[in-house]
C-alpha cells in the first residue's frame, strides 16, 4: 500500500491529526520536500544577521551579515567582524599585519610574503602589509618585449599584502 503522506507536496505536511490530510505549513515554517510529517521552523535572521532571502512555504530563510561583518560556516552560521586590508582579527580586535606578512582581504589571517627564491625568481615588487611580494620571471623566462627584472632595494618600511 502506498503511504498517503507521499502525496503531500513541498510546502505542506501530512497531518496525522486530520486523517493524514495534506495541510499547508503554518506561518513561519516550511517543508522543502514532499511527504513530510512536520514542517520546519523558519530561520530568523536577527541581530548581526540580516535576511538575504525570505522564508517561503517551500524554502528556509537565508541570512547574511550586516555591513562590517562577514559570514563564516555553512549557510552563514556565524558572523565575524571585518578588518581592514593589511590587518587580521585577533582576540583584542583588528591588528596590523607584522612586517613580512600581508592580508589583502577583510577576513582571514596575515600570511608571509611569497619567497620568490623558492621558484628561482627575484623580487619584482616589494610587499606591503596589504599586498604580497611580486616575483619576476626567472632569467630563462626573459625575452625581448618582456619587463626587465631588476630587484628593487629592500623595503625600509613595514609592509604587508593581499589575498
Amino acid at each position: 500500500l502506498q503511504d498517503p503522506c507521499s502525496n503531500c507536496p513541498a510546502g505542506t505536511f501530512c497531518d496525522n491529526n486530520r486523517n493524514q490530510i495534506c495541510s499547508p505549513c503554518p506561518p513561519n515554517s516550511f517543508s522543502s520536500a514532499g511527504g513530510q510529517r512536520t514542517c520546519d521552523i523558519c530561520r530568523q535572521c536577527k541581530g548581526v544577521f540580516r535576511t538575504r532571502k525570505e522564508c517561503s512555504s517551500t524554502s528556509n530563510a537565508e541570512c547574511d551579515c550586516t555591513p562590517g561583518f562577514h559570514c563564516l560556516g555553512a549557510g552563514c552560521s556565524m558572523c565575524e567582524q571585518d578588518c581592514k586590508q593589511g590587518q587580521e582579527l585577533t582576540k583584542k580586535g583588528c591588528k596590523d599585519c607584522c612586517f613580512g606578512t600581508f592580508n589583502d582581504q577583510k577576513r582571514g589571517i596575515c600570511r608571509p610574503w611569497t619567497n620568490c627564491s623558492l621558484d628561482g625568481k627575484s623580487v619584482l615588487v616589494n610587499g606591503t602589509k596589504e599586498r604580497d611580494v611580486v616575483c619576476g620571471p626567472s632569467p630563462a623566462d626573459l625575452s625581448p618585449g618582456a619587463s626587465s627584472v631588476t630587484p628593487p632595494a629592500p623595503a625600509r618600511e613595514p609592509g604587508h599584502s593581499p589575498q
Epitope: 577576513r107 608571509p112 610574503w113 615588487v125
Partner: antibody, heavy 127, light 110 residues
Framework: EVQLLESGGGLVQPGGSLRLSCAAS????????MSWVRQAPGKGLEWVSV????????YYADSVKGRFTISRDNSKNTLYLQMNSLRAEDTAVYYC????????????????????WGQGTLVTVSS | QSVLTQPPSASGTPGQRVTISCSGS????????VTWYQQLPGTAPKLLIY???HRPSGVPDRFSGSKSGTSASLAISGLRSEDEADYYC???????????FGGGTKLTVL
C-alpha cells in the same frame, strides 16, 4: 600552451539553470586560481567568481551571489559554474580565466592578472 | 556603473602616444595591484600589464602602465592600427571581496 575550452552555454528561460564547464590543459591546473568573467552583448567585462586551489575559497560578484556556484575538479582539470535562478541580465559570453602566480609558492595571485582566457560560451536567458 | 572609472573612448593617429586613465578608491587601486587587458574585436581579452607596470613576455614595450594613489594609467606610444581595441583596467577590491573591472575604453586609431 595554456588552453581553456568553455562549454555548456545555450538558451534558457528566466528562472532556469545551466552548468558551464571549462576544460583546462597546458598547465598545472591544481596550482592556479581560476575565475569566470562575463561580457554582455556590446558591454564591458564583468568578473563573476573566483576559486582558489589551495583552500577552495570562493568569492562572487554581488550580482550573482546566492545564485551561482563555482567549483573545480582538479583531477579532471575542469572548472565549473552552476547558474541557477537565471535572469535576462545574465545573458552574456562567459569566459573562463586562469590567474597568474602558481600556488602554494605564490601566496596571492592578484598582482599577476588573468593570463589565460578561453574563447567563451554564450548564455542567453530569454522566454 | 563600474567601480573603476575609465573614459569610454580614446583616439589617436598612427605614431602618436595615447593615455587611458582608470580611477578607483583606496579599497581597490589604492592598496592593490592594477592589471590591464586588451580585447581585439571578436576575441577574448589578453593580459597586457600586471602588477601596475610590468609587461608579460611578448607584450611590446610600446605599452606601459603606471599608478599613483587611487588612479592608474595605460600609455601606448608609437600607435599602430592593430592597437585598435577595447582596453580594461582591473584590480582586487578588498571591501567587495572580489575583482573589479573598469567599464572599458574603446581606442580608435584614426
Amino acid at each position: 600552451e595554456v588552453q581553456l575550452l568553455e562549454s555548456g552555454g545555450g538558451l534558457v528561460q528566466p528562472g532556469g539553470s545551466l552548468r558551464l564547464s571549462c576544460a583546462a590543459s597546458g598547465f598545472t591546473f591544481s596550482g592556479y586560481d581560476m575565475s569566470w568573467v562575463r561580457q554582455a552583448p556590446g558591454k564591458g567585462l564583468e568578473w563573476v567568481s573566483v576559486i582558489y586551489p589551495d583552500d577552495g575559497n570562493t568569492y562572487y560578484a554581488d550580482s550573482v551571489k546566492g545564485r551561482f556556484t563555482i567549483s573545480r575538479d582538479n583531477s579532471k582539470n575542469t572548472l565549473y559554474l552552476q547558474m541557477n535562478s537565471l535572469r535576462a541580465e545574465d545573458t552574456a559570453v562567459y569566459y573562463c580565466a586562469k590567474h597568474g602566480g602558481q600556488k602554494p609558492t605564490t601566496k596571492s595571485s592578484s598582482a599577476y592578472g588573468m593570463d589565460g582566457w578561453g574563447q567563451g560560451t554564450l548564455v542567453t536567458v530569454s522566454s | 556603473q563600474s567601480v573603476l572609472t575609465q573614459p569610454p573612448s580614446a583616439s589617436g593617429t598612427p605614431g602618436q602616444r595615447v593615455t587611458i586613465s582608470c580611477s578607483g578608491s583606496s579599497s581597490n587601486i589604492g592598496n592593490n595591484y592594477v592589471t590591464w587587458y586588451q580585447q581585439l574585436p571578436g576575441t577574448a581579452p589578453k593580459l597586457l600589464i600586471y602588477a601596475d607596470s610590468h609587461r608579460p613576455s611578448g607584450v611590446p614595450d610600446r605599452f606601459s602602465g603606471s599608478k599613483s594613489g587611487t588612479s592608474a594609467s595605460l600609455a601606448i606610444s608609437g600607435l599602430r592600427s592593430e592597437d585598435e581595441a577595447d582596453y580594461y583596467c582591473a584590480t582586487w577590491d578588498y571591501s567587495l571581496s572580489g575583482y573589479v573591472f573598469g567599464g572599458g575604453t574603446k581606442l580608435t586609431v584614426l
